[in-house]
Interface confidence: low
């Protein structure tokens, strides 16, 4: 795997024991884009000291790319050349077009708390004048 | 072709010790969280332990928690089980199993190897 | 933890029947589902994970659907091949639980 293991906690095991679940998953929310241009979806989880094991970026039950504690990423081989790793968690996508329109989730595989999704909906125009959503940091 | 091999089974009488290995090849071992998951005669399966692929997660299942430590020297491509004050409900088929990257299911096995713990 | 109960526990179809086998989550697991068949003497054969997604080199006559509590393995047209017991487990979140697993005999 050519890229750098994000620096946080865990390993590669998925999280669950029956704690409760106190995090919350925040995101970019809705947003929208120009096509053939890139967008960078950001997903950030708070409130629970959960160890992240696994983060799940997946659109319509397709596995985009997964970056794993000890592993680093993995980029589905159907969208290696539209997909990039970060920053951070987040993933880029590339070469937008009209199809890329819909549901987003990033899934944050914790123990022992479980597993916690987000959800982001992006629109591709057609036009220049697409609207991005706020600049979503990670603190 | 991917290919786990378990080893180390046997006869021990309750209170004993037996350490369980898994040759894995085909693979970058390295890569990939391990499983050892059991399944007693004529039982369904029961999940025993997981170490991540640089183990930096250890989980048991509570029925062998404090009595068996997993391990992986990825070096020599191989995982372990060490099963310390064995009790006659630990009796098995022993399988090591390599756990999917992208989601936590188990998509190679090996064949097995038998413990039975009897007097 | 998460209890997951499959029915039934055996049955007994012709080749070319359609088979269906539920598991019941005693939680929501999301879609994070995992289908394995056995065969006696052999070890478990991952079909499907994720709830419906097909492992690599597994026949197309055998599908999963089912999301948060209730899931569905279906053999579309059984084989002698598939005479075998399934297994589902969930693989939401640790400890990784499996049903008791459901025997798929020959009428």
């Known amino acids: 795997y050519p890229y750098d293991v994000p620096d946080y906690a865990g390993g590669g095991g998925s999280g669950g024991g029956g704690s409760m679940m106190t995090g919350t998953i925040e995101t970019t929310g809705n947003i929208s884009a120009e096509k053939g241009g890139s967008i960078i979806l950001q997903c950030h989880l708070s409130s629970t000291t959960a160890q992240v094991t696994q983060v799940n970026w997946e659109q319509q039950d397709q596995l985009l790319a997964a970056c794993n504690a000890d592993l680093g990423w993995h980029i589905s081989p159907s969208f290696k050349d539209r997909v990039a790793p970060g920053p951070g968690l987040g993933l880029t996508l590339q070469s937008l077009t009209v199809n890329d329109t819909g549901e987003y989730f990033c899934i944050y595989h914790t123990y022992p708390d479980g597993t916690y999704t987000g959800r982001i909906f992006l629109e591709v125009l057609e036009s220049s004048v697409a609207e991005h959503g706020a600049r979503f940091q990670i603190p | 072709e991917v290919q786990l091999v378990e080893s180390g089974g046997g006869l021990v009488q309750p209170g004993g010790s037996l350490r369980l290995s898994c040759a894995a090849s085909?693979?970058?071992?390295?890569?990939?969280?391990m499983h050892w998951v059991r399944q007693a005669p004529g039982k369904g399966l029961e999940w025993v332990a997981f170490?991540?692929?640089?183990?930096?997660?250890?989980y048991y299942a509570d029925t062998v928690k404090g009595r068996f430590t997993i391990s992986r020297d990825n070096a020599k491509n191989s995982l372990y089980l060490q099963m310390n004050s064995l009790r006659a409900e630990d009796t098995a088929v022993y399988y090591c199993?390599?756990?999917?990257?992208?989601?936590?299911?188990?998509?190679?096995w090996g064949q097995g190897t038998m413990v039975t713990v009897s007097s | 933890d998460i209890q997951m109960t499959q029915s039934p526990s055996s049955l007994s179809a012709s080749v070319g029947d359609r088979v269906t086998i539920t598991c019941r989550a005693s939680?929501?697991?999301?879609?994070?589902l995992a289908w394995y068949q056995q065969k006696p003497g052999k070890a478990p054969k991952l079909l499907i994970y994720?709830?419906?997604t097909l492992q690599s080199g597994v026949p197309s006559r055998f599908s999963g659907s089912g999301s948060g509590t209730d899931f569905t393995l279906t053999i579309s047209s059984l084989q002698p091949e598939d005479f075998a017991t399934y297994y589902c487990?969930?693989?939401?979140?640790?400890?990784?639980?499996f049903g008791g697993g459901t025997k798929v005999e020959i009428k």
């Open positions: 199993a390599r756990m999917r990257l992208d989601y936590y299911a188990m998509d190679y």
């Open positions: 085909g693979f970058t071992f390295s890569n990939f969280g």
């Open positions: 170490i991540s692929s640089g183990s930096s997660s250890i």
């Open positions: 939680k929501s697991i999301s879609k994070y």
């Open positions: 994720s709830g419906s």
């Open positions: 487990q969930q693989h939401n979140e640790y400890p990784w639980t």
